[in-house]
Every structure is written in C-alpha cells, then in structure tokens.
C-alpha cells in the first residue's frame, strides 16, 4: 500500500476546521475490515485517531478529530481537525496498514490574523518640534509572531530606537507592542505595519502630527 499526503503544509486559521489530506490506493476487493488506519503526532507518536478492522476507534485528541467514513473505502484516509488551536501546530503521520503498510507525514501550520493596530503617543499634548516622543503601536491576537515595520511620511523605514515585544496569551496568540522613540519634526506621519508572515497579511496603523492638536487617521 502506498500512502500519499500533500507536501505543502496545511495552513489553518485558529478556531476553524482543517483537513489533513491522506490517501491510499485500495486493491480490487478491498474491504474496510482489512484496514488499520492510525493518525499520530509524528514527533511523539501520540495517538490522534484510529480506525481498526472496520471500526472507527474515535478521537484520542481532545475529541476534535474525525475521519470521513464514507470515503475510506475509496482510499480517502483524511483527518478532519475541528476548532484548530495554536497547540495543534506540528506534524501528523498517516499510517495505513492493509496487507503491508506505509506512512507519510503532513504539517499543520496554524495562523491567526492580527488586529488593526492602535496607536498611542506619550506625551500626547504640548508637543513642540524637537521634542522626543514615544509612539506605541499595538496589535492583538495574531499567530505566529509578527514582523513589525515602521516608516515615516515619505515611506522611509525607521529602524533606530524601535523596541518590539510580543507576548503570548493563554490561547497561544500573540499581542504585539512596538515602541518607536522619535524626535518630532515640524509635522509628520509615522506608520506601523504589523505583518503575519504565514498569512502574508498586513495590518496598518499611523499617526499624523500637524502642529497642535495631534490627529489620528480615521479607522479604515
């Protein structure tokens, strides 16, 4: 028996369902009573889901997995993983045994989009050209860790005096806080871009300083 899986990682959004595709080519006369199908975590060999001798043995993985029973006889051994979590990320091995056996691994990459950044200034009043200000760009509930870029009004990257911290919450999602310390010009716009490297999703935030008072562009 030959097992086939997709070579590319499966990308799944947090809280959605993902299908880990796995197939085999049944011989003529094949019946499910001959099939041993096991899905396991590749690294640890921990059982995820199994099907033995015509019987679905159920989910051993927080009761969030399912096979496609009606498609098994056609050689579709795919696994459905429901309500994907950050902790589900990793490699899964599909192990099929009929007379002989074969296995193949498929990777699951979990992702969550970052929120539109919120911008704050400190100090936020009585600002004069030449003052040092701290601009904080905050974006929430993304995965995996973000890439953060700062630019000025002319699109020139600002790389000095930037401190970025990323903290995972109890669900494993990251909150990003990036702080830019800059000396004010007469007026200027400062933009922060938070990029999710897996989703290639960019979230933008900016603040414009035009003398007094400071203005924030309206939410998109």
């Amino acid at each position: 028996v030959e097992v086939q899986v997709s070579e590319d990682p499966v990308v799944a959004l947090v809280d959605t369902d993902a299908t880990l595709r796995c197939s085999f080519s049944p011989e003529p006369g094949f019946s499910l009573a001959q099939l041993n199908l096991i899905w396991q975590l590749t690294d640890t060999k921990q059982l995820v889901h199994s099907f033995t001798e015509g019987r679905d043995q159920g989910s051993a993985y927080s009761n969030r997995t399912a096979l496609f029973p009606d498609l098994l006889v056609q050689g579709n051994a795919s696994l459905r993983l429901q309500r994907v979590r950050v902790t589900d990320e990793g490699s899964y091995t599909c192990f099929v045994s009929i007379q002989d056996f074969d296995s193949a691994a498929v990777s699951l990459q979990v992702a969550a989009p970052y929120s539109k950044p919120s911008m704050t200034l400190e100090p936020n009043k009585d600002l004069r050209p030449g003052n040092m200000v701290t601009i904080t760009c905050s974006s929430y509930q993304g995965y995996p860790e973000a890439e953060v870029f700062w630019k000025d009004g002319q699109g020139v990257p600002l790389t000095g005096n930037v401190t970025t911290s990323q903290m995972a919450n109890e669900r494993g999602l990251f909150d990003v806080h990036s702080v830019l310390r800059v000396v004010l010009g007469a007026n200027g716009t400062y933009s922060c871009l938070v990029r999710n490297p897996v989703l290639q999703q960019d979230a933008h935030g900016s603040v414009t300083i035009t003398g007094q008072p400071l203005t924030f562009p309206p939410e998109a």
Epitope: N36, I38, T52, R55, N63, F95, F101
Partner: antibody
Framework: QVQLVQSGAEVKKPGESLKISCKAS????????MHWVRQRPGKGLEWIGM????????NYNERFKRKATLTVDKSISTAYLQWSSLKAEDTAMYYC??????????WGQGTLVTVSS | QIVLTQSPSTLSASVGDRVTMTCSAS?????MYWYQQKPGKAPKLLIY???NLASGVPIRFSGSGSGTSYTLTISSMQPDDFVTYYC?????????FGQGTKLEIK
C-alpha cells in the same frame, strides 16, 4: 492459538522502577493494539494505556502518563510496561491484553507486583 | 472521562435463576463490552458490541442496551457463573470499566 505470556511476579521497594514483559504468539503481533490494565487487590480494572506495535503509536490514560511507559520489540513479538517510582499503592496485578476492533479479546495471565519496604 | 456504574454491586442468586445486571454510562456510548473474571484469573471477554457472544461463550449469556443503559443477562445460572462481571466502553478515551458486579450464591 493466541497466547500472551507475561513475566513473573515482582517484589519491589518504594521508589524503584519496574519492567514487565508480555510475549505474544499465535497471531500477527504487529497488527493489533496491545493494552495494559491493572487491578489492585480486591478492586476493579483500570486501563493504563495501549500501543500499536507496527506504528509505535501509543495512548495513555492521563492518570498514568507520568508513571507508565509502553514499548514493544517487534522482532520478538513482546510488549513491555515500564513503571517508574513505585509506591505501595502500585501493588497490583498488571495484565496485558490484545484487542481486535473495540474489544480486548485475549489477556495475559497477569503479573503480580508487590511494593513494600 | 466516561464513568460506568454497575448495579447492583453484589447480587445473590441460586443455580437456575435468571439474573440481570446493568451498566449505566455517564454519557452515551456506542457499544458495551462485558467481561467475566474468576478469582485469581484474568478477565475473559463475554460480550462484544453490546450483544454479540464472544467465541466459546455459552448462549445463556446475552447483552442488550443502547445510549447510556446496558444490561447483561444470564438466563439460567450455573455454578461456574458465581464470579465477578465487568462492563467496559471504548467510545471515548480513556477506556473505562465499571466497578464490577459480584454474583454470590444465595
């Protein structure tokens, strides 16, 4: 005919570890889940976990995850239960059992483990 | 985990009696399995998939039920049957057993 023959009785001191064997014959050892179950004196049956020899896949009862390690040696059709840091309350009969579909249809004779200082 | 509660814990009967014991699951299970255990021996599979007799088991044993309620019936008790019986489920992990029903001679 299917046979599961377990290693002999063991007397251990608290804190010691233990390795019990279960030698299978009469069927294709590689293709069937092997379970381990324990029974403390005068008590009921407790499922420890199971292992599939062919793939090496295992599943533990969370309760015993830190205590038990299941392994197999396919070349000699033998399953093993390793138990770490024994306590007096681990005194029990330990059984291996082969399963087909969803039933454990053949059981070993049991290995009596006594933990006493 | 699914908790299986067997009742009664102890049952007194005489040879020839019809005996029924029950196994109640804390949540629905697809199938129930029944084992017989004699003193000092390993458990032996009696009933699989709720109602199917395992190989070599006398037809006086029968099983039934669905959902959360299952029964094992012995139609005519024989001297050999006065031992302990366990139910077991494999509908979810961990696999669990009932606490047992012990049959005693009245």
């Amino acid at each position: 005919q299917v046979q599961l023959v377990q290693s002999g009785a063991e007397v251990k001191k608290p804190g010691e570890s233990l390795k019990i064997s279960c030698k299978a014959s009469g069927y294709n050892f590689n293709n069937y889940w092997m379970h381990w179950v324990r029974q403390r004196p005068g008590k009921g049956l407790e499922w420890i976990g199971m292992i599939h020899p062919n793939s090496g896949t295992f599943n533990y009862n969370e309760r015993f995850k830190r205590k038990a390690t299941l392994t197999v040696d396919k070349s000699i059709s033998t399953a093993y239960l390793q138990w770490s840091s024994l306590k007096a309350e681990d005194t029990a009969m330990y059984y291996c059992a082969k399963s087909t579909a969803l039933a454990t249809d053949y059981w070993g004779q049991g290995t009596l483990v006594t933990v006493s200082s | 985990q699914i908790v299986l509660t067997q009742s009664p814990s102890t049952l007194s009967a005489s040879v020839g009696d019809r005996v029924t014991m029950t196994c109640s699951a804390s949540s629905s299970v697809s199938y129930m399995y029944w084992y017989q255990q004699k003193p000092g021996k390993a458990p032996k599979l009696l009933i699989y998939d709720t109602s199917n007799l395992a190989s070599g088991v006398p037809i006086r044993f029968s099983g039934s039920g669905s959902g959360t309620s299952y029964t094992l019936t012995i139609s005519s008790m024989q001297p050999d049957d006065f031992v302990t019986y366990y139910c077991q489920q494999w509908s979810s992990y961990p696999l669990t057993f009932g606490q047992g029903t012990k049959l005693e001679i009245k």
